[in-house]
């Protein structure tokens, strides 16, 4: 019997009865938060062989082993994972061993076994036989191995029953408990599973089988299960589902899961029955079960219940992530915030259409509206009083609407209104009228020429660069000396520069009024000599990197009511010179014969130019006679290898550490102080543990059901 779509057993151990007839759990299995120690011996679920997602155990008092509960659990598929893990055993106070002696395969994901104070038999399990990669396993904070004294079956009687494998250079017996070995298949089976009698299973079997070479006798399937048979692919008119079985179209059409209830139902795509069309695809019609490729970014319609969505923080903007069509009105009211422009672009940058109006008011943190980088249509189906569909009021730092050279925006219905935007030049507003097709709709008072742009240098002159010189990490630029009508109005220049791999940056990228700015800024004073052109040396740059640079004249803002002229340059793109590359990474050498060495390496992390070739140098080294002075057949450890540069590999002290004379003074050696890298690694480790624990708590603590 297939049980699903995930089983959560908590608070009451008797809920375990729900597993009684399950052979496959299609989904996850949670057993957690059972605080009263119970006797679990009467609970046994021998039918359960496969969990398609993950197994999570957390704070189950009194449970000493999983072997009696799940004696035949063979495969955890890891189709969906719990924070990258397919098996999580966390804070199981009484667990003494894992004991899942029939667990043969964790198809995807790693394991996390942490903070189980009584848990032993961890070092006796060879996880590499169960998982593809053991490097992501996290086994920390359990009972120290020295206190465990793990013994595999028959070891005491000197009749060991289990097989040996090597883990971390230790060749040892592998077992789950004192009386259960870890099963290994004969090498003749290769990657195939085997029966209890060591006969090889059919190649489509995973984990184990009840009869050899029979695709109907598998405990679990390597690929897909259909009508009692393990198959490499789903037959015609059936579709892959949940990563393990084949279902028909009707089944797929009728799925109503808690996770997918808001969607339009499951879809069939690329031979799979799935919850939504994958990235880059959209349904072929609103109620279709089939997907077609999107042209450009896939549309995602978002609707606001209350008709008007107020964006007053990053959190409120977050709700619009991925939306391309917004059904309703946008009211933007961003008074403050950290790194606000790029955050808003991240969450609102895909919006192409707003069906109602857009109102930007009291948004003192905004310098530009370029964060709405894909907005192309305001329908104006709903308008503000006075028939306004684009309304911009009292934004103290707003300087740019959009980069009109690269922007097509249409306002289908309604008028525009601009007032009290002191840094927004009227010319910018008039340009918007032309682009959006609203010219002629506005009445005289809708665009206030007195209080828009009153504190800005609106009639800009163009500053021209006169020379550029580059080296590997420096750029020297000079520009024409700017002469405003009254020379006293010119205070200084500001040079803006940043890395720009592509020639597509604008002045307002990532800029807001709260100090965030993706541009580096350098102030340049006027040269005292009137004949000398102003210039700057930008240093500390990266070799072979393209930079964008522009210069602005800093001028007095206002003389009474006259708008004063400002000046700035076009954006200049300039690349620093190439330099010596950093060293090649991960150099490995191995000998494949008595006269050849194979050397491999990865490219340098900083090529600092276009790499054209590598130089490989080698030289013959004299053989170290020290190597011959050790009997390699003895059980003692191989001696420490001494290296020419004076550094040595510190051998981990195992038994009977001897006190040695160090540094000319008597006394034991002290542990070396931790390096910065080690300290950083420890810090990251602690942080990672916290993040996981938070994730665990957030995932499993839910309000009590009604």
């Amino acid at each position: 019997e297939i049980c699903g779509p995930g089983i959560d057993i908590r608070n009451d151990y008797q809920q375990l009865k729900r597993l009684e007839n399950c052979t496959v759990i299609e989904g996850y299995l949670h057993i957690l938060l059972i605080s009263k120690a119970e006797d679990y011996r009467s609970y046994r679920f021998p039918k359960l062989t496969v969990i398609t997602e993950y197994l999570l155990l957390f704070r189950v008092a009194g449970l000493e082993s999983l072997g009696d509960l799940f004696p035949n659990l063979t495969v955890i598929r890891g189709w969906k994972l719990f924070y990258n893990y397919a098996l999580v055993i966390f804070e199981m106070t009484n667990l003494k061993d894992i004991g899942l002696y029939n667990l043969r395969n964790i198809t995807r994901g790693a394991i996390r076994i942490e903070k189980n104070a009584d848990l032993c038999y961890l070092s006796t399990v060879d996880w590499s036989l169960i998982l593809d990669a053991v490097s992501n396993n996290y086994i920390v904070g359990n009972k120290p191995p020295k206190e465990c004294g793990d013994l595999c079956p028959g070891t005491m009687e000197e009749k060991p029953m289990c097989e040996k494998t090597t883990i971390n250079n230790e060749y040892n017996y592998r077992c789950w408990t004192t009386n259960r070995c870890q099963k290994m298949c004969p090498s003749t089976c290769g990657k195939r599973a085997c029966t209890e009698n060591n006969e090889c299973c059919h190649p489509e079997c995973l984990g184990s089988c009840s009869a050899p070479d029979n695709d109907t006798a598998c405990v679990a399937c390597r690929h897909y299960y259909y009508a009692g048979v393990c198959v490499p692919a789903c037959p015609p008119n059936t579709y892959r589902f949940e990563g393990w079985r084949c279902v028909d179209r009707d089944f797929c059409a009728n799925i109503l899961s808690a996770e997918s209830s808001d969607s339009e139902g499951f879809v069939i795509h690329d031979g799979e029955c799935m919850q939504e069309c994958p990235s880059g695809f959209i349904r072929n019609g609103s109620q279709s079960m089939y997907c077609i490729p999107c042209e450009g970014p896939c549309p995602k319609v978002c609707e606001e219940e209350k008709k008007t969505k107020t964006i007053d923080s990053v959190t409120s903007a977050q709700m619009l992530q991925g939306c391309t069509i917004f059904k309703g009105n946008l009211l933007i009211n961003i008074r403050r915030g950290n790194n606000i422009a790029s955050e808003l672009e991240n969450f609102m940058g895909l919006i192409e259409v707003v069906t109602g109006y857009v109102k930007i008011r009291h948004s003192h943190a905004l310098v530009s509206l370029s964060f709405l980088k894909n907005l192309r249509l305001i329908l104006g189906e709903e308008q503000l009083e006075g028939n306004y569909s684009f309304y911009v009021l009292d934004n103290q730092n707003l300087q740019q609407l959009w980069d009109w050279d690269h922007r097509n925006l249409t306002i289908k219905a309604g008028k525009m209104y601009f007032a009290f935007n002191p840094k927004l030049c009227v010319s910018e507003i008039y340009r918007m009228e032309e682009v959006t097709g609203t010219k002629g709709r506005q009445s005289k008072g809708d665009i206030n020429t007195r209080n828009n742009g009153e504190r800005a240098s609106c009639e800009s002159d163009v500053l021209h660069f006169t020379s550029t010189t580059t080296s590997k990490n420096r750029i020297i630029i000079t520009w024409h000396r700017y002469r405003p009508p009254d020379y006293r109005d010119l205070i200084s220049f500001t040079v803006y520069y940043k890395e720009a791999p592509f020639k597509n940056v604008t002045e307002y990228d990532g800029q807001d009024a709260c100090g965030s700015n993706s541009w580096n800024m350098v102030d340049v004073d006027l040269p005292p000599n009137k004949d000398v052109e102003p210039g700057i040396l930008l240093h500390g740059l990266k070799p072979w990197t393209q930079y964008a640079v522009y210069v602005k004249a800093v001028t007095l803002t206002m003389v009474e009511n006259d708008h004063i002229r400002g000046a700035k340059s076009e954006i200049l793109y300039i690349r620093t010179n190439a330099s010596v590359p950093s060293i090649p990474l991960d150099v490995l050498s191995a000998s494949n014969s008595s006269s050849q060495l194979i050397v491999k390496w990865n490219p340098p992390s900083l090529p600092n130019g276009n790499l054209s070739y590598y130089i490989v140098r080698w030289q013959r080294q004299p053989q170290d006679g020290y190597l011959y002075r050790h009997n390699y057949c003895s059980k003692d450890k191989i001696p420490i290898r001494k290296y020419a540069d004076g550094t040595i590999d510190i051998e981990e002290v195992t038994e009977n550490p001897k006190t040695e004379v160090c540094g000319g003074e008597k006394g034991p050696c002290c542990a070396c102080p931790k390096t910065e890298a080690e300290k950083q690694a420890e810090k990251e480790e602690a942080e990672y543990r916290k993040v996981f624990e938070n994730f665990l708590h957030n995932s499993i603590f839910v309000p009590r059901p009604e």
Epitope: I2, G6, G27, I255, L256, A258, S286, P705, E706
Partner: antibody
Framework: QVQLQESGPGLVKPSETLSLTCTVS?????????WNWIRQPPGKGLEWIGY???????NYKPSLKDRVTISRDTSKNQFSLKLSSVTAADTAVYYC??????????WGQGTLVTVSS | DIVMTQSPLSLPVTPGEPASISCRSS???????????LQWYLQKPGQSPQLLIY???NRLYGVPDRFSGSGSGTDFTLKISRVEAEDVGVYYC?????????FGQGTKVEIK
Amino acid sequence: QVQLQESGPGLVKPSETLSLTCTVSGYSITGGYLWNWIRQPPGKGLEWIGYISYDGTNNYKPSLKDRVTISRDTSKNQFSLKLSSVTAADTAVYYCARYGRVFHDYWGQGTLVTVSS
Amino acid sequence: DIVMTQSPLSLPVTPGEPASISCRSSQSIVHSNGNTYLQWYLQKPGQSPQLLIYKVSNRLYGVPDRFSGSGSGTDFTLKISRVEAEDVGVYYCFQGSHVPWTFGQGTKVEIK
């Protein structure tokens, strides 16, 4: 693989409350789907009574709304029907069934409830 | 409530001959999402109902292709191209587009 099993008294006295339970195995009732009660008076057609959804919300047939309650016990993976003030007209085979996005895909085998004194 | 009216209520058939059952709804059963949730169920004697056709014309996987459904708006039809002995039972139409969901009163198909 999903199984539904109705249980409850086969005989109820008039004016009393009819109580039935549907035990679901093979699928968690909180995981999705709409969990329905449907009845069929002897020799007559099928009549939809109502459902409880995976998230606990209900929908009832308006003519029965004042007398019917469908509830659930998530720890036992069961949902229940209570029909108060029964009369002989409530004598029927009562089915529990699962409804997805489009149709009923699993039905119980039905249990006959007779209303008689 | 939407009333589903089936005709005929009884349909004696000869094996190998075609049969047709009509189902009319008292109002349109097109859902707001554009789908028409009209199903046909067969209830064999002593059994629970089993689904044959969903969303007007989609035959359930495993149902013989002699069964077909058609119609739109308020008028729907179930056709059996060649009746077989195992097709006897009561056929119900059902609408799941508007709550309360409703069944037709049933059409009894029996062999002549």
